[in-house]
Interface confidence: low
């Protein structure tokens, strides 16, 4: 065992090349200089090292950089990145978007691993906020990224970054997240004309308050049922039958198919049956004529 610690004569690596594939683990350890490896990291990915050989290379880099790898090495890690633990990554200071892209590319097509999540966390914290270019990059690799953030973390997203958000990026967001994102979107798109504004804001409407829905109802937007069903129940309840009719336009007929589901069900229960009848859809469950309709805020005050 002892003689294995010294590099055999003539085996000392002068550069990182394919000849190293045939080295045993102990030979790699003994014959590859860590500083040489660090300067030629870009070559490692072109060489089909075994899983175990990659462990040796990682170990050499760990010994050379116990406080964490420099960005010049990190950018060229390639598949060696998959060997890193979240603990390793927490020691890094990644500032370049190109480095982030290079590492995300390695994991492309796979679900977000704890390593990737840690890398993103380090990168975003280093930048101080989730700027547009970063958001563009992250949502390109992980469409659900935005919805994996807590409302507190989303609060660091500047309104300008909202332009990078695509509808599918918000598919898994819950109301608490949309509550944070909607005001930013409203700010980001405020200078657009009516129809263009609606196209952009539509995905964020799950965070919209009643007043904004009332305003939209005056703009002939023809909201589709899928969007309507994602609205906050508490924002929909105060809308009148006439306002919902204007908001949905020709899509109002879809209410019938959704009458047992929230928020339609709860909204129906708050409307006068006479008003519902004016829609001609056969919606049932409204308040019969002659009954007092309590204001929602008053109801909450009484309970």
């Amino acid at each position: 065992e002892v003689e294995k610690t010294a590099c055999p004569s003539g085996k000392k690596a002068r550069e990182i090349d394919e000849s190293l594939i045939f080295y045993k683990k102990w030979e790699l350890e003994a014959c590859v200089d860590a500083a040489l490896l660090a300067t030629q990291m870009d070559r490692v990915n072109a060489i089909p090292f075994t899983y175990e050989q990659l462990d040796v290379l990682k170990h050499k880099l760990d010994e050379l950089y116990p406080q964490g790898y420099p960005e010049s090495v990190i950018q060229h890690l390639g598949y060696l990145f998959l060997k890193m633990s979240p603990e390793d990554i927490r020691k890094w200071n990644v500032t370049s978007l190109e480095t982030l892209k290079a590492l995300l590319e390695v994991n492309k097509g796979h679900e977000m691993s704890p390593q990737v999540a840690t890398l993103i966390d380090r990168f975003v914290k280093g930048r101080g906020q989730l700027d547009k270019d970063t958001l563009d990059t992250l949502t390109a690799f992980y469409p659900g990224y935005l919805c994996s953030l807590s409302p507190e973390e989303l609060s660091s997203v500047p309104p300008s970054s909202i332009w990078a958000v695509r509808p599918q990026d918000l598919d898994t967001c819950d109301p608490r997240q949309l509550d944070v994102l909607y005001p930013k979107a409203r700010l980001a798109f405020q200078n657009m004309n009516g129809s263009e504004y609606f196209v952009k804001i539509q995905s964020f409407l799950g965070g919209a308050p009643t007043e904004d829905l009332k305003a939209l109802s005056q703009q002939n937007v023809s909201m589709d049922l899928a969007t309507f069903m994602k609205l906050r129940t508490d924002a929909v309840l105060p809308l009148t039958v006439a306002e919902v009719q204007k908001l949905l336009g020709p899509h109002v007929e879809g209410l019938k198919a959704e009458e047992r589901h929230r928020p339609v069900r709860d909204w129906i229960l708050r409307q006068r049956q006479d008003d519902l009848d004016t829609l001609g859809l056969g919606l049932q469950g409204g308040i019969p004529n002659g009954y007092l309709v309590l204001d929602l805020s008053m109801q909450e005050a009484l309970s």
Epitope: P86, E87, D121, S148, L149, S150, P151, E152, E153
Partner: nanobody, 119 residues
Amino acid sequence: EVQLVESGGGLVQPGGSLRLSCAASGSTSSINTMYWVRQAPGKGLEWVSFISSGGSTNVRDSVKGRFTISRDNSKNTLYLQMNSLRAEDTAVYYCNTYIPYGGTLHDFWGQGTLVTVSS
């Protein structure tokens, strides 16, 4: 040091539900991300879900829509709500976290709780 104690495992029929808990004690103020990791019989460890101190969460694709991770910082407890359980979810489930001290990061694991999904 951090001590992690899991509970809530057991035998459940396919389609059933379980809620796992992991109580943390010791240097809990240093805890950042917490993980649920599982090991099926004869298989290696695989992470199931994790939650950051800020509350952002991730679950692996195979359990998405069925498992939900949460934590109650006031009780120093991590939870995993498992619904629509399948036979392939049978495994020992471990709670895992790390804390920095002494200049390095230290990993901590619970003893594990066995979840068996079988009819």
